[in-house]
């Protein structure tokens, strides 16, 4: 298995994690995308996902997580607002492409949230809540059940690599199952 790379983010409670997952290829633009947490010894757990098909520049909010898919630049923007210490962990973006396995986007995100207020403009709880007021109608995305751990063996694409997804991938089971996305408290 290829060793996966991680990008570390160290933030304070109340701040916002703002990352971009780079999916590059046009064939993925309309695919449903998800933000997952990976806990030791467990399967990746989907926390939020875009609609299916994914809509361009249309924010989807699930609790404190906001996803925005920018088709024209091949970027999925993920924001986790009002961070809590317990949000610390390893996260990843994936692209759902049933019946194939989800396609993992690199790098994984190692989030470390510590106690204490940084005082950075726009990072306190009040301003975070003001900036990210999104209509509740955007919180109803449903995500497929993620069942395969095999994405962890994929090598990260290099600049000049052909990163089109291989055709010989194992099919997902329970592809018709959907679960309601868990909402952060």
């Amino acid at each position: 298995a290829t060793k996966l790379t991680e990008e570390k983010y160290e933030l304070k409670e109340g701040q916002t994690l703002d990352v971009k997952c780079d999916y590059t290829l046009e064939k993925f633009a309309s695919s449903q995308k998800a933000w997952q947490i990976i806990r030791d010894g467990e399967m990746p757990k989907t926390l939020a996902c875009t609609e299916r098909p994914s809509k361009n520049s249309h924010p989807v909010q699930v609790g404190r997580i906001i996803l925005e898919d920018y088709h024209d630049h091949g970027l999925l923007r993920v924001r986790m607002v009002n961070l809590q210490v317990e949000d610390s962990g390893l996260y990843q973006c994936v692209i759902y492409q049933p019946p194939k396995e989800p396609h993992m986007l690199f790098d994984r995100i190692r989030l470390v949230v510590t106690k204490g207020f940084s005082g950075t403009p726009g990072s306190n709880e009040n301003s975070t809540q003001n900036v990210y007021k999104i209509p509740p109608t955007t919180t109803k995305a449903l995500c497929p059940l993620y069942t395969s751990p095999r994405t962890v063996t994929q090598a990260p694409p290099k600049s000049t690599a052909d990163v089109s997804t291989p055709d010989s991938e194992i099919n997902l089971t329970n592809v018709t199952d959907i679960i309601r996305v868990p909402v952060f408290n």
């Epitope: 971009k20 590059t24 064939k27 633009a29 024209d72 630049h73």
Partner: antibody, heavy 121, light 111 residues
């Protein structure tokens, strides 16, 4: 190995037409947008236009200097991109390069060797 | 259209010395914190060769004496120690907006 080979260049009179081809190999052609870039002798690079993939309905975009005169197309079954040039002007004289990007709005990692188009009476 | 202006137009640097080329955009070429600005090297009779992509990422196989920096509207290509084979014309290019555009080029020579 990725290869891009342009063909179809030559001498044409002002007002005439010419169709350039770009034969691609070594990658999944249908996955990537294809671009044309030109360079007049002793001058800089000028982006001509691009054609996106089937996922984006083969949308095309052009530089203002060629819009309405040039048309980019592609045949995914033949792994080939085309540049149809009509109403040619002397200022269209240049080496025309076919290039492949690395994905949506990404860099040009691969270039052909170019084909020379000369517009002259 | 986004206009890219390179400076200087030409540059003569001694072997082993640092060479710096600037590229200024008429408007930001960033989307979020990604800069869609790339650098190419072109030698006579050859197609351009990608050096740096998205402002600061070194293309595979390119010597690490090349580096890129900047964001928004101001970008820099630096060659830390000029080698004879670096004599070429260098171009910046933006892909943040259609139409894509190139800078006018900077000719690098040995002093």
């Amino acid at each position: 190995e990725v290869q891009l080979v342009e063909s179809g260049g030559g001498l044409v009179q002002p007002g005439g037409s010419l169709k350039l081809s770009c034969a691609a190999s070594g990658f999944t052609f249908s996955t990537y947008a294809m671009h044309w870039v030109r360079q007049a002798s002793g001058k800089g690079l000028e982006w001509v236009g691009r054609i996106r993939t089937k996922s984006s309905n083969y949308a095309t975009y052009y530089a203002a200097s060629v819009k309405g005169r040039f048309t980019i197309s592609r045949d995914d079954s033949k792994n080939t991109a085309y540049l149809q040039m009509n109403s040619l002007k002397t200022e269209d004289t240049a080496v025309y390069y076919c290039t492949r990007d690395m994905g949506i709005r990404r860099q040009f990692a691969y270039w052909g060797q170019g084909t020379l188009v000369t517009v002259s009476s | 259209d986004i206009v890219l202006t390179q400076s200087p137009d030409s540059l003569a640097v001694s072997l082993g010395e640092r060479a710096t080329i600037n590229c200024r955009a008429s408007e930001s070429v960033d989307t979020f914190d990604y800069s869609f600005l790339h650098w190419y090297q072109q030698k006579p009779g050859q197609p351009p060769k990608l050096l740096i992509y998205r402002a600061s990422n070194l293309e595979s196989g390119v010597p690490d004496r090349f580096s890129g920096s900047g964001s928004g509207t101001d970008f820099t290509l630096t060659i830390s120690s000029l080698q004879a084979e670096d004599v070429a014309v260098y171009y910046c290019q933006q892909s943040n907006e259609d139409p894509y555009t190139f800078g006018q080029g900077t000719k690098l020579e040995i002093k």
